[in-house]
Interface confidence: low
């Protein structure tokens, strides 16, 4: 069945209740350098007035605090109303290293990143953080980097292993989640001259994704304990038609060309699915298309094989899919699928539908392909246009945590954490905000607030108070590795 | 129990036209879909095509295109096959079946037949 | 369109001994893992009944002694042990690409 009822039941205590920004840009400078300059001025207000130094006086200075950063104020004032106990974000590559390799590192980019996550954990928000968060409209990478091919040349993936060194060198003792890559499955979007085009890339990006995480492996993890993944699109497709042959196989093939794609190779086989690979050859022996996936070494399927810590997806629809067998050598029409708009269902300003119960199918279909593992979903919300009382945010979120929470109590899916998408909206994009662009709270924040302080849908009677130990823990180790690092 | 009921035997004249009927009972009707099975006199079984009674949508045998239309009503829980411009080589008994669809699954198989309807094509 | 020819045409078995009819595709009938093979039994005046479905899946309620094995484009139904009520003409049915087509039938006579 599509929907079943409502369930009412409670996520386990160490569940992770979040939300989830993109990329932040570091504030170059802290905001309120007056504590940080010793000497004294007298304003000639009469005058000319400008500030004239007293020679030979020093006063006493304060050191430099993250709060000097309007940004970050910012950024905790609101996650302080959001209660969430995480928080997701994106650091910007070519900020931190914008040569592309160590030659050149940004301080004090690494600084206000470190001030995001330590003062984060003062309020007891613990950081999921992203290293490379590619957008349709901005590739994200340093300079020399996307002047010398971007991620169609192999040695980007090397350059991204020297810049996750850094980054859990800098940030390591203070983060214990890490997403190398937020949905590397969507790059097809940029990368999509052709169809070897995108695969090549996708290549490189698995190949990145694996350096980094048997970097963090061998060298950081015996002293941080921390966990890395990478995050993938995970939209749930069903057929069209549900009587047509031809439309399940095409749901199926989207999953696998979509997700199975990325997770194949790192959670289970070292290679890609040998379902895509065979329907990409099959096309290519019938004269419709000349991709063909990447063949890979033995060595390379050795890198690539069982390089994650845990399950990270990100989802917000589900897709209504038919076959149509297109010609063309791109990484769409190697696919021949053909998505339909349900016009009779709920949707978004962006037309997004709201289909709470593919979530849960999508859950269980990780699980069947890849294994019972610790899952998080990762993002996952829509575009809600009403500026306060944003009611389809609200709907969307009680339903779709509705359908986590059964996958959770009743299929017994391993699901450690929800992370809504997202904190605040960027002006003239879509409104997936819990805040305005101008940071004007939306009703939504209240409901997901609920959520979180009951641990799900309790029964009536039911506590939703977690043992001292259990709610207190990681902030008393977070507490005191920022007293320990400044 | 699950039946699906045809109607009785037809002869007609060549070039004409005739209608046969589907009747579904013990099960929801719009919840699968019903091909048609044609059988010529001591030969083998060819698949004409199905329509997905929820829709109305149908998919041919190419080899049927023309010569078939498949329709139902819903209201009555009948599938209806129309057969063209009939010749001797459609002297055939004619079989409804149900297939049944299992969440994930896209294997093709017919679990419950009809009766099957003779049809005799003669001047 | 994928054509499955079936052999024997047909043959007789001893009461208790074990019938096998093959079912060869003009190509592949697999699918990521999968068998896309059917069988069924008819009787004469009877409309066909399923026995096997996915190559080697009993549909409930047929008996144990019905079994089918193969995978691409070799087929075989086996009967064993072989009863008076197994008399009737058996077909394969390929589901993995349209046209469904069948086999041309193999009919089995009990001696």
């Known amino acids: 069945k599509e929907s079943t009822p409502d369930v009412q039941g409670q996520f386990p205590c160490d569940f992770s209740w979040g939300v989830t920004e993109s990329v932040l840009k570091p504030e170059s400078v802290a905001s309120s350098p007056q504590f940080s300059d010793p000497h004294l001025y007298v304003w000639n207000a009469t005058g000319n007035r400008l500030l004239h130094r007293v020679e030979g006086v020093r006063l006493k200075t304060r050191p430099a605090q993250c709060t000097d950063f309007v940004n970050i104020k910012k950024q905790l004032e609101m996650l302080a109303r959001m209660k969430v106990t995480h928080y997701r974000f994106a650091l910007d590559w070519a900020s931190v290293l914008p040569t592309g390799n160590l030659s050149a590192v940004n301080r004090q980019a690494l600084r206000y990143y470190r001030c995001v996550v330590s003062e984060g954990l003062k309020l007891g928000i613990s950081a999921m953080v992203t290293l490379y968060y590619p957008t349709h409209a901005h590739l994200g990478l340093p300079e020399p980097l996307l002047h010398a091919d971007g991620w169609l040349n192999p040695s980007t993936a090397e350059a991204f292993q020297a810049y996750a060194g850094l980054c859990f060198q800098e940030l390591g003792d203070l983060v214990k989640l890490w997403i190398t890559i937020n949905e590397p499955n969507r790059l097809s979007d940029i990368y999509n001259r052709s169809g070897n085009d995108t695969y090549g890339a996708a290549h490189n990006l698995l190949v990145a994704h694996a350096l980094a995480w048997r970097l963090y492996d061998r060298q950081f993890r015996p002293s941080q304990r921390g966990a890395v993944s990478l995050s993938l699109h995970a939209d749930w497709a069903e057929p069209a038609n549900p009587y047509a042959d031809s439309h399940w196989r095409a749901a199926e093939r989207f999953l696998q060309f979509e997700i199975a794609w990325f997770a194949e190779p790192l959670f289970k086989t070292g290679d890609y699915p040998a379902a895509m690979r065979e329907y990409i050859a099959s096309k290519h022996r019938r004269g419709l298309s000349s991709s063909a996936l990447p063949r890979l070494t033995e060595a390379e399927r050795r890198l690539l094989k069982g390089t994650v810590d845990f399950c990270a997806l990100n989802h917000f629809t589900t897709r209504f899919v038919m076959h149509e067998q297109l010609a063309g050598s791109r990484y769409d029409s190697d696919r021949d699928i053909q998505f339909l708009q349900d016009i009779t269902r709920l949707s978004s300003p962006t037309r997004l539908a709201v289909i709470p119960w593919g979530v849960r199918k999508l859950l269980r279909w990780v699980r069947r392909n890849y294994g019972d593992m610790d899952i998080y979903i990762t993002a996952s919300g829509i575009d809600d246009q009403a500026l306060e009382d944003d009611r389809l945010r609200k709907y969307y979120l009680g339903k779709y945590l509705q359908e986590v929470l059964k996958a959770y109590l009743i299929d017994k899916v391993r699901i450690k954490g929800y992370y809504a998408f997202k904190l605040a909206e960027e002006k003239s994009k879509p409104r997936f905000g819990f805040f305005t662009s101008d940071f004007k709270a939306k009703s939504s924040i209240q409901f997901y607030n609920k959520v979180i302080s009951s641990r799900g849908f309790p029964f009536e009677n039911s506590s939703s108070r977690c043992s001292q130990t259990q709610e207190n823990t990681e902030c008393t180790v977070c507490l005191f590795l920022v007293q320990k690092k400044p | 129990q699950v039946q699906l009921q045809q109607s009785g035997p037809e002869l007609v004249k060549p070039g004409a036209s005739v209608k046969l009927s589907c009747k579904a009972s013990g099960y929801t009707f719009t919840n699968y879909d019903i091909n048609w099975v044609r059988q010529r006199p001591g030969q083998g079984l060819e698949w004409i095509g199905w329509i997905y009674p929820r829709d109305g949508s149908a998919k041919y045998n190419a080899k049927f295109k023309g010569k078939a239309t498949l329709t139902v009503d819903t209201s009555s829980s009948t599938a209806y096959m129309e057969l063209h411009s009939l010749t001797s080589e459609d002297s055939a008994v004619y079989f409804c079946?149900?297939?049944?669809?299992?969440?994930?699954?896209?294997?093709?198989?017919?679990?419950?037949w009809g009766t099957g309807t003779t049809v005799t094509v003669s001047s | 369109d994928i054509v499955l020819t079936q052999s024997p045409a047909s043959l007789a078995v001893s009461l208790g001994q074990r019938a096998t009819i093959s079912c060869k595709a003009s190509q592949s009938v697999d699918y990521d893992g999968d068998s896309y093979m059917n069988w069924y039994q008819q009787k004469p005046g009877q409309p066909p009944k399923l026995l096997i479905y996915?190559?080697?899946n009993l549909k409930s309620g047929i008996p144990a002694r019905f079994s089918g094995s193969g995978s691409g484009t070799d087929f075989t139904l086996n009967i064993h042990p072989v009863e008076e009520e197994d008399a009737a003409t058996y077909y394969c049915q390929q589901s993995n690409e349209d046209p469904r087509t069948f086999g041309g039938g193999t009919r089995l006579e009990i001696k």
């Open positions: 996915a190559a080697s």
């Open positions: 079946a149900r297939r049944p669809l299992y969440y994930g699954s896209t294997h093709w198989y017919f679990d419950v």
